[in-house]
């Protein structure tokens, strides 16, 4: 969630904007899993070897840490500037963006870059802005914020009620859960009173690490090592390598080439969360990893040394084969997934498209002024139009109808700019099967 | 509802500069390259350079490299050109004029412009 | 510098009729699949009006009888029906290039 200010359409009326929430900052809640194949294993190894010089790259630097204090210049490589930097009016530069001031993640063409997101009251920085990424926001300990009410953090309930258990604890993104003593089904809505019930400090673990644990983790720990040693010095090793090479090129595109058009820094995928859940926590620098919920089964975006700014091309020809469903990542409300999102349409729909869209989506003029004239400023108009179309059309408000009409008006890089978009906040995820069997 | 709001009409003398100012409200002034156009009397524009709000960063039309210098105020979101060495060839209306893109690929169109500045260079 | 050329100066038309104006470059002014050619209106003593940008988008406000068409080196501008107001000098414009670049106009009289 990309709060604009230097490139905002209007100043005034501007929607409060929160950084990205847990799924895109942290991913599942931290506890051990058991890598699936030998693979996982290999890769665990490599990444850790190379997690220190791949993740970090100059850009990302404090200021002072970094060789000029100006803004750095380089070339636009087909009219598209690397993450970290705008392009100037002429086309001929990529500028830096100002440490701690803006950002840009992905390849852009933007004609500045994004300003960062300040962390409300109530809420931790959980990392800063750099020039590739916003400042991370999340709820301070005992509150959590919700998905479908994003707009402040709330109070974690101190215990359950009478007759329910406790199974899960407060995080900055859920509640405490309880669940009925007998039936174990989980209780959904408020609670008017607590009455008979089980505490814990919020943000604690249900139970504390055992010796077990301990144990299991270094054993885990140990084959990991062992069979890395192995596998190296084996001949398994050209055997493996290519695999790798598949999947940190999003299965099978060369890892020469970037992607202009799908890029979604950040949004590591399940392969990816494997791998970081056999590693120690101090081992990759938490904040550059910024794990997600899976956009694709397949595309390790781990940056290498050498491609530091570039991120790896999915394969073009699976692409082309099926059309790409888009679905709600937390298997939520389609429309309602898709309603959270539309805060930050205005951004990527360029102002004189919004009215010709909304006309597309079957709003008729008198709405669009009613929007207009109800809107909070310039900055919502686009907003209030499309909750106006979501109103209107109920069910049928689907994200494929929203990009097909900007596809028919020719807004392609808006419609690429809102499909990474909704990716890449971890709302929606790349469901693959064959148009007709189309989801909302 | 965006506005630029140029300095009034100037009669100024040969050899002279004159600084023109361009007041921008209504939206993010440093989200918004600004440009500055020439029209002589009864003529076609022409397009003198633009200024980067957000970081001073200027290009010219080579034509007016030494004629023009642009600079911005970003406390008080205005836009100023001024014209050095000024020759009855300068007489002639100016507009700012904002470029309403965010994007390049937008195409870097002039949405608002400035009520105009008139000046006259005369003995 | 692209040098863009509006071939006629001058144009009569009768009301309610369709009135065509022309713009050619001396080079492609195409970018990011984009037409980086835009149309304004003038009108005396009033700065410039944007009509239409990008070849071919309406610009908000705008009414629906302009239209623009067009890519790479040959645009047109079309006002269809053509009405009172319209009377004006019409400019193309490009913006792929620096320095950027005007037309010499097209001045639009009701016949």
């Known amino acids: 969630m990309e709060q604009r200010g230097q490139n905002a359409p209007a100043a005034s009326g501007a929607r409060k904007r929160h950084g990205p929430g847990p799924r895109e900052a942290r991913g599942a809640r931290p506890g051990p899993r058991v890598p699936k194949t030998l693979v996982l294993v290999v890769a665990a190894v490599l990444l850790l070897v190379s997690a220190e010089s791949a993740l970090i790259t100059q850009q990302d630097l404090a200021p002072q840490q970094r060789a000029a204090p100006q803004q750095k210049r380089s070339s636009p490589s087909e009219g598209l500037c690397p993450p970290g930097h705008h392009i100037s009016e002429d086309g001929r530069d990529c500028i830096s963006c100002k440490y701690g001031q803006d950002y840009s993640t992905h390849w852009n063409d933007l004609l500045f870059c994004l300003r960062c997101t300040r962390c409300d009251s109530g809420e931790v920085e959980l990392s800063p802005c750099t020039t590739t990424r916003n400042t991370v926001c999340q709820c301070e300990e005992g509150t959590f914020r919700e998905e479908d009410s994003p707009e402040m953090c709330r109070k974690c309930r101190t215990g359950c009620p009478r007759g329910m258990v406790k199974v899960g604890d407060c995080t900055p993104w859920s509640d405490i859960e309880c669940v009925h003593k007998e039936s174990g089904t989980k209780h959904s809505g408020e609670v008017p009173a607590v009455e008979e019930t089980v505490t814990s400090s919020p943000g604690t673990p249900a139970s504390p690490c055992s010796l077990s644990g301990i144990i299991i983790g270094v054993t885990v720990a140990a084959v990991v090592l062992i069979v890395a040693v192995f596998v190296c010095k084996s001949l398994l090793w050209k055997k493996v390598l290519p695999y790798l090479k598949g999947i940190c090129s999003g299965g099978g595109g060369d890892p020469e080439r970037v992607d202009r058009s799908s890029q979604r820094p950040g949004a590591e995928d399940n392969v990816l969360n494997e791998i970081v859940s056999i590693l120690q926590p101090t081992q990759v620098p938490e904040q550059e990893m910024e794990v997600q919920e899976p956009a694709e089964p397949t595309g390790v975006n781990m940056l290498s040394p050498g491609e530091s700014e570039h991120l790896l091309e999915p394969a073009e020809a699976e692409r082309s084969q099926r059309r790409r469903l888009l679905v709600p990542a937390n298997e939520g409300d389609p429309t309602e997934t898709l309603r959270q999102c539309f805060d930050d349409f205005a951004d990527l729909v360029p102002f004189d498209s919004w009215e010709p869209l909304m006309r597309k989506l079957g709003l008729m003029d008198n709405e669009i002024k009613v929007a207009k004239a109800e809107a909070a400023g310039h900055r919502d108009t686009l907003y209030t139009m499309l909750i106006k179309w979501v109103n209107k059309t109920g069910r049928d408000a689907s994200v494929h109808t929203l990009l097909d009409a900007l596809e028919t008006l020719g807004e392609r890089l808006a419609k690429q700019k809102i499909e990474d978009h909704l990716l890449s906040s971890g709302k929606f995820m790349y469901l693959e099967g064959n148009a007709d069997s189309a989801m909302s | 509802e965006v506005q630029l709001q140029q300095s009034g009409p100037d009669l100024v003398k040969p050899g002279a500069s004159v600084k023109i100012s361009c007041k921008a409200s209504?939206?993010?002034?440093?989200?918004?390259?600004m440009h500055w156009v020439k029209q002589s009397h009864g003529q076609s524009l022409e397009w003198i350079g633009r200024?980067?709000?957000?970081?001073?960063?200027?290009g010219y039309n080579q034509k007016f490299k030494d004629k023009a210098i642009l600079t911005v105020d970003k406390p008080s979101s205005t836009a100023y050109m001024e014209l050095r060495s000024l020759t009855s060839e300068d007489s002639a209306v100016y507009y700012c004029?904002?470029?309403?893109?965010?994007?390049?690929?937008?195409?870097?169109?002039?949405?608002?412009w400035g009520q105009g500045t008139t000046l006259t260079v005369s003995s | 510098d692209i040098v863009l050329t509006q071939s006629t100066p001058s144009l009569a038309v009768s009301l309610g009729q369709r009135a065509t104006i022309s713009c050619r470059a001396s080079?492609?002014?195409?970018?990011?699949?984009?037409?980086?050619m835009h149309w304004f209106q003038q009108k005396p003593g009033q700065p410039p009006k944007l009509l239409i940008y990008?070849?071919?988008n309406l610009e908000s406000g705008i009414p629906a009888r302009f239209s623009g068409s067009g890519s790479r080196t040959d645009f047109t501008l079309t006002i269809n029906p053509v009405e009172a107001d319209d009377v004006a000098t019409y400019y193309c414009?490009?913006?792929?290039?620096?320095?950027?670049?005007f037309g010499g106009g097209t001045k639009l009289e009701i016949k």
């Open positions: 080079e492609s002014v195409d970018s990011y699949g984009n037409s980086f």
């Open positions: 990008r070849a071919s």
């Open positions: 004029a904002r470029n309403g893109a965010y994007y390049r690929s937008d195409g870097n169109y002039f949405d608002y």
């Open positions: 414009q490009q913006s792929n290039e620096d320095p950027y670049t």
């Open positions: 200024v980067n709000p957000n970081n001073g960063g200027t």
């Open positions: 209504g939206y993010s002034f440093t989200g918004h390259y």
